[in-house]
Each structure stands twice: as C-alpha cells, then as structure tokens.
C-alpha cells in the first residue's frame, strides 16, 4: 500500500527555494507552482518528489508504523524506507502487513534460512531436501511500503 498524496491544504513556505521549470517540468525535490512559472523545493523531512514532474504539491513522506523500523529517513528526493522489525517479514504477495516469522520447522525438517525482514524461515525435509512453506499467521498491524509507482520502487 502506498501512502502518497498531493496535499492541497499545504502552501509553499516563503523560505522555500524557487527556480524556473525546464520544459514545463521541475526537478526531483521540487514541485511546480499553479501558474507553472516556478519550481518550489519540497520541505525536507515532510515531503518529496523522486522524478521530474509538474506536481502542484510534493508527496507526503511516509511515516513508519509501529512494527516497522525506519531504514532510511525521508529526503526531498526520496521517501522514507520502512522495514519490518526483527522477527517479522513482508511478503511480496501481501506487502501491506508484516507477518510473524515461524519460530521453528516442523518435525523431520531442518532450517536452512533464517527469518529476514523480507522472508520467513525456510525449512527443508531432512531426507529429500525439498522445501516446505507453511501458513504464516498475520500480525494485526498494517504497514506501508515506499512509493509504488512503476519507476520508483524504494524498498
């Protein structure tokens, strides 16, 4: 789930740096004024833009939820990067939640891979060496990932 928004309530502060658009676009770290005449810098730690754009407002920085740790803080050109805390992981199929890693392998199986923020433990049969994937209980905590636009996967 992406938490990106162009917030119409927020207006540029007087101290923000301004420059002229190039080919009608503003560089990363900026947004455009409503009359298209100026590029206005995003506010560090509050909002950002990753590409050349003509956004009327910069994108709001993601705030990591409880159950997540902040790996990289938000800059004017990059969103916050949040990661599942130790003992939990985020699956590609359900990136909106951190799931609890399994504590061990079923009988007759051996652990070959530890829990990481991106994957559960991996178990294989002692004899055959074939993988085993079990159902994992979901942690009741919704979390967010970095911008999910096609051009800017950040986590």
């Amino acid at each position: 789930i992406t938490r990106q928004s162009l917030d119409p309530q927020r207006r540029a502060a007087p101290q923000q740096k301004r420059s002229s658009p190039t080919e009608g676009l503003c560089p990363p770290g900026h947004h455009i004024s409503e009359d298209s005449r100026e590029c206005i810098s995003c506010k560090y730690g509050q909002d950002y833009s990753t590409h050349w754009n003509d956004f009327l407002f910069c994108l709001r920085c993601t705030k990591c939820d409880s159950g997540e740790v902040e790996v990289n803080s938000c800059t004017t050109t990059r969103n916050t990067v949040c990661q599942c805390e130790e003992g939990t992981f985020r699956e590609e199929d359900s990136p909106e939640i951190c799931r609890k890693c399994r504590t061990g392998c079923p009988r007759g199986m051996v652990k070959v891979k530890d829990c990481t923020p991106w994957s559960d433990i991996e178990c294989v049969h002692k004899e055959s060496g074939t993988k085993h994937t079990g159902e994992v209980p979901a942690v009741e905590k919704t979390v967010t990932t970095s911008p999910g636009t096609p051009a800017s996967p950040c986590s």
Epitope: E23, I32, W52, N53, F55, T149
Partner: nanobody, 126 residues
C-alpha cells in the same frame, strides 16, 4: 486525496470511435499534466497521450498519433480521449493518470504516475 474516475469504454468494431472521459473527483488533478496509459492483455502498461491543462499542449505516443485526440475541460475538471479509426491492437484497459513522472525534463513520455484511475476496458473486435 486525488481520485480519478474513467468512463466511456466498451466494445467497438474496427474503424469505429469511442470517447473516454477522466474526471477528478477531488478539487484537483494534483498536477498540470494529465495523461492516458493503456495495458493490453499480457502486456505492460504503455503511455498513450497527455495534455497540459494550463496551455493545452498535447503529447502522443507514435502508435496513436493522428487517430487519438486528447482534450480538457477545466471548468468540469475533466480530460477526454477521443479515439478514432480504432484497431484490434488498441484493445486494452485504458487508465487515466495524474502526477506524471519523467526521468528527464526533455522527455515526452512519462515513466510513471502517482495517481491512477481504476481503468476502463476498450475492446476493438468485429
């Protein structure tokens, strides 16, 4: 929050026409340019057209130039895509997009967007 709502898709015969509409349900599209992308079955999303809502400058993919026309009605907060001389290869889900993103200032084709509509299906078949 910017929300985009497309309409106007449907089934049409080769050579026929359709007009797609994209309305911003909030107060704004959130950006000066608004565009259309499409995704054919089993293919990636591709840029179709965009318009600058301030000055009316238009941008088109080569595959639709001369057949598709993008326009806007700022009073209605709506952007239109008039599609003429439709071909079977135009069959796709068409998405309205705002907050277009570019790798370079000189680029005419955006690499992505922040806001997307839910899409409207256009089927060109006899």
């Amino acid at each position: 929050e910017v929300q985009l709502l497309e309409s106007g898709g449907g089934l049409v015969q080769p050579g026929g026409s359709l007009r797609l509409s994209c309305a911003a349900s909030g107060r704004t599209f959130g950006s000066i340019r608004v565009g259309w992308f499409r995704q054919a079955p089993g293919k990636g999303r591709e840029f179709v057209s965009a318009i600058n809502r301030n000055d009316g400058t238009t941008y088109y993919a080569d595959s639709v130039k001369g057949r598709f026309t993008i326009s806007r009605d700022n009073s209605k907060n709506t952007v239109y895509l008039q599609m003429n001389s439709l071909r079977p290869e135009d069959t796709a889900v068409y998405y309205c997009a705002a907050g277009l993103q570019y790798n370079r200032a000189a680029d005419r084709v955006p690499v992505g967007a922040v806001y997307w509509g839910q899409g409207t299906l256009v089927t060109v078949s006899s």
